[in-house]
């Protein structure tokens, strides 16, 4: 067995704000230290936590893909919100990619809903 310093973990990272855990958990925007003694602030714009937690690492902020726009930037308590660019949408069954919206409806159908970042245009049959 190798013997080392009892608690190198107790040494503070000076650039990060610290507080004490409550019942073993740290508040949103923080993660817990390795010795469970402190809550360490997540790094703004880099990582975050949304709930009370005992994370050893805050969660990494999402980076919007090309074809997406950043609607809300990442804070220490909220992940980045990305949205499909105009003219594209995200389908529920394939949320990882933005698909091009259809430019028009098939013959005999009429558009009742425009393209949004969450849905394609909607077409219904023309009433005769």
């Amino acid at each position: 067995i190798t013997r080392q310093s009892l608690d190198p973990q107790r040494r503070a990272a000076p650039q990060q704000k610290r507080s004490s855990p409550t019942e073993g958990l740290c508040p949103p925007g923080h993660h817990i230290s390795e010795d469970s003694r402190e809550c360490i602030s997540c790094k703004y714009g880099q990582d975050y936590s949304t709930h009370w937690n005992d994370f050893l690492f805050c969660l990494r902020c999402t980076k919007c893909d090309s074809g997406e726009v950043e609607v809300n930037s990442c804070t220490t308590t909220r992940n980045t919100v990305c949205q499909c660019e105009e003219g594209t949408f995200r389908e529920e069954d394939s949320p990882e990619i933005c698909r091009k919206c259809r430019t028009g409806c098939p013959r005999g159908m009429v558009k009742v809903k425009d393209c949004t970042p969450w849905s394609d245009i909607e077409c219904v049959h023309k009433e005769s």
Partner: antibody, heavy 117, light 108 residues
Framework: EVQLLESGGGLVQPGGSLRLSCAAS????????MSWVRQAPGKGLEWVSA????????YYADSVKGRFTISRDNSKNTLYLQMNSLRAEDTAVYYC??????????WGQGTLVTVSS | EIVLTQSPGTLSLSPGERATLSCRAS???????LAWYQQKPGQAPRLLIY???SRATGIPDRFSGSGSGTDFTLTISRLEPEDFAVYYC?????????FGQGTKVEIK
Amino acid sequence: EVQLLESGGGLVQPGGSLRLSCAASGFTFSSYAMSWVRQAPGKGLEWVSAISGSGGSTYYADSVKGRFTISRDNSKNTLYLQMNSLRAEDTAVYYCAKGVRISFDYWGQGTLVTVSS
Amino acid sequence: EIVLTQSPGTLSLSPGERATLSCRASQSVSSSYLAWYQQKPGQAPRLLIYGASSRATGIPDRFSGSGSGTDFTLTISRLEPEDFAVYYCQQGSNQPVTFGQGTKVEIK
């Protein structure tokens, strides 16, 4: 004095399972994050998995995700690594270590896991 | 994933000489989360330095660590016979935790 003692290693066939244990003493076990680190024969060190003091948060290397499960029993001062679907490339000495991010300040002596048919 | 590249792979020196080991990260690492270890054949690694520059308890002052950002250095001011071993750097700044591939310090 801090002590970490691993057990449970041995020879296992590919696709098989093994459960490693690490008995800890000399510190307040339930307060500390713990890790497993492995070393393949003649190779360098590879972090495998980590767990928070309460056991509420767990982390894994991509190479073992979905196959290995880290857990702890704070009432027994024991850390575990359940290894399923073992592959030849999992052959290594597995070390139990105290800590995860700032440093691994204490290490066990290691237990050898050999995956071979 | 942060890749740590150690250089040189092998360092051939004589006792009494100075050893300078480098650890370069593929992206910036918080100094609080950079450590160095020594490992001898058949033994578990031993913590030397944590927080990039703080010596662990019982580590002789001939061992020192320095650096920030992406470049870190372990220096052994005067090599003793027991210092010939493999040295690893490790980062815990980002998940997953990663180690360098190691530098072997051997007797010339």
